[in-house]
């Protein structure tokens, strides 16, 4: 998977008046990494992992960047003409990626009241707008403002892209990100499904990086995809990930089934418990 840095900024307006603060979150490799503390007006690391990435360096650069981005987004919201009374939001999501072959990707997306209305692929300088008339109007509005604003030229977007990549590379220099390996906790549970059948579920949690193989085996052979149900690999809020796989088996055949897990070059197999619940920690 590529390494990525994702900025998520939101500004609000009330009855047509743009509010002074802004919300900002930054994700590194899909994990919550930074957020903007509105009380202290500072960028704050999200958890110990994020703190470790920069070590004892300050977060001044991140604070400055987020503050600048928030200011830009507030100005953009002020130029959206169709603001009705009540609360409205403008959200900008900016992502840059570095792939295994060292190629890069960069994109930018704008949402109004949670609805996507404008996207840009920075490399190709291609803007895309959803079909809806509301999105078309909003996009035209914002594009016109961005064109008017001398700052928002092609060079500006490429500079933003370059800054994003520069930051990403800086974070990746930290061995905490590149060499971080957290083995999963694996637990297997069983539940009655229907007469003569049980559902067995294998859960892997608290692992990093995101890539994992989790599959049910019968007699040591992987079950076919259509007999297994997989959960998404999702962040668990602690800078790590979680996922699951389930299948239905005949009662009395439990000993034939094992959950196979492979992560970061290590692997383990986990039997189906004979009782109701069994939690097994992987020890490598």
């Amino acid at each position: 998977e590529p390494h990525s840095l994702r900025y998520n900024l939101t500004v609000l307006s009330w009855d047509g008046s743009v509010q002074s603060g802004f919300l900002a979150e930054v994700h590194l490799d899909g994990q919550p990494f930074l957020r903007y503390d509105r009380q202290k007006c500072r960028a704050k690391p999200q958890g110990q992992w994020a703190e470790d990435v920069l070590g004892n360096k300050t977060w001044d650069r991140e604070t400055r960047d987020l503050t600048g981005n928030g200011k830009d987004l507030r100005m953009t919201l002020a130029h959206i003409k169709d603001q009705k009374e009540g609360l409205h939001s403008l959200q900008e999501i900016r992502v840059c990626e570095i792939h295994e072959d060292n190629s890069t990707r960069s994109s930018q997306h704008f949402y109004y009241d949670g609805e996507l209305f404008l996207s840009q692929n920075v490399e190709t300088e291609e803007w895309t707008v959803p079909q809806s008339s509301r999105a078309q109007t909003l996009a035209m509005n914002v594009r016109n403002f961005l064109k008017e604003d001398a700052m928002k030229t092609k060079t500006h977007y490429h500079a933003m892209h370059a800054d994003c990549l520069q930051e990403l590379r800086r974070y990746l220099e930290s061995s905490v990100v590149l060499r971080r390996r957290v083995p999963p906790m694996v637990n297997v549970t069983r539940s009655e499904a229907s007469e003569g059948n049980i559902t067995v579920t294998c859960r892997a949690s608290s692992f990093y990086p995101r890539n994992i193989t989790l599959t049910w085996r019968q007699d040591g052979v992987s079950l076919s995809h259509d007999t297994q149900q997989w959960g998404d690999v999702l962040p668990d809020g602690n800078g790590t990930y979680q996922t699951w796989v389930a299948t239905r088996i005949c009662q009395g055949e439990e000993q034939r089934f094992t959950c196979y897990m492979e992560h970061s070059g290590n692997h383990s197999t986990h039997p189906v418990p004979s009782g109701k619940v069994l939690v097994l920690q992987s020890h490598w």
């Epitope: 052979v221 076919s224 000993q255 034939r256 094992t258 692997h267 197999t269």
Partner: antibody, heavy 118, light 108 residues
Framework: QVQLKQSGPELVKPGASVKVSCKAS????????IYWVKQSHGKSLEWIGY????????VQNQKFKGKATLTVDKSSSTAYMHLNSLTSEDSAVYYC???????????WGQGTLVTVSS | DIVLTQSPTTMAASPGEKITITCSAS???????LHWYQQKPGFSPKLLIY???NLASGVPARFSGSGSGTSYSLTIGTMEAEDVATYYC?????????FGSGTKLEIK
């Protein structure tokens, strides 16, 4: 490439026991099960049982329970089958096999001939 | 135990001939659990076809497999001298795993 190297032929007396070994190489030993199969002279194949080298869990053919004991030594990537109380009925070629995770007996050892004779 | 009955028990074929070996199960099995092996004289068995119709690595395309339920078959499109061997079907659907009694294929 995946290789399973079995121990050499054994000539044993009735009532004695024998331990057949199967050394795996070319893959991570604890990743895949080791299966054991018996082939009596000029006959078909009979499945004895299998062992999961990661945790030592076994599943056996009821017919061979009490006859065959399956174990592994992870440090040497070797699987063992101990056969006890041997009779002439146990004279056969014994094979170990492993899987690639998609089919049961994907790779086979060269076989170990066990002859039970007084 | 699931009994697998193979036929014929032995057969002789000329080079270039099409061969079909059948395997009949005493009870229905899913096609995911039926495999075929080839054993040449003096050698270990070798996986030929897995999950009814998938060719194992390095197996020539003249071999094919098909079937479902209780009836399965192995076909050699054009017999070659090197195909002289005993062929076994095997089920992994229920414990104990069982093998067919084998079909010995000779050359005319």
């Amino acid at each position: 490439q995946v290789q399973l190297k079995q121990s050499g032929p054994e000539l044993v007396k009735p009532g004695a026991s024998v331990k057949v070994s199967c050394k795996a190489s070319g893959y991570a030993f604890t990743k895949y099960n080791i299966y054991w199969v018996k082939q009596s002279h000029g006959k078909s194949l009979e499945w004895i049982g299998y062992i999961d080298p990661y945790n030592g869990g076994t599943v056996q053919n009821q017919k061979f329970k009490g006859k065959a004991t399956l174990t592994v030594d992870k440090s040497s990537s070797t699987a063992y089958m101990h056969l006890n109380s041997l009779t002439s009925e146990d004279s056969a070629v014994y094979y170990c096999a492993t899987t690639d995770g998609y089919s049961l007996f994907t790779y086979w050892g060269q076989g170990t001939l066990v002859t039970v004779s007084s | 135990d699931i009994v697998l009955t193979q036929s014929p028990t032995t057969m002789a074929a000329s080079p270039g001939e099409k061969i079909t070996i059948t395997c009949s199960a005493s009870s229905s099995i899913s096609s995911n659990y039926l495999h075929w092996y080839q054993q040449k004289p003096g050698f270990s068995p070798k996986l030929l076809i897995y999950r009814t119709s998938n060719l194992a690595s390095g197996v020539p395309a003249r071999f094919s497999g098909s079937g479902s339920g209780t009836s399965y078959s192995l076909t050699i499109g054009t017999m070659e001298a090197e195909d002289v061997a005993t062929y076994y079907c095997q089920q992994g659907s229920s414990i104990p795993f069982t093998f067919g009694s084998g079909t010995k294929l000779e050359i005319k």
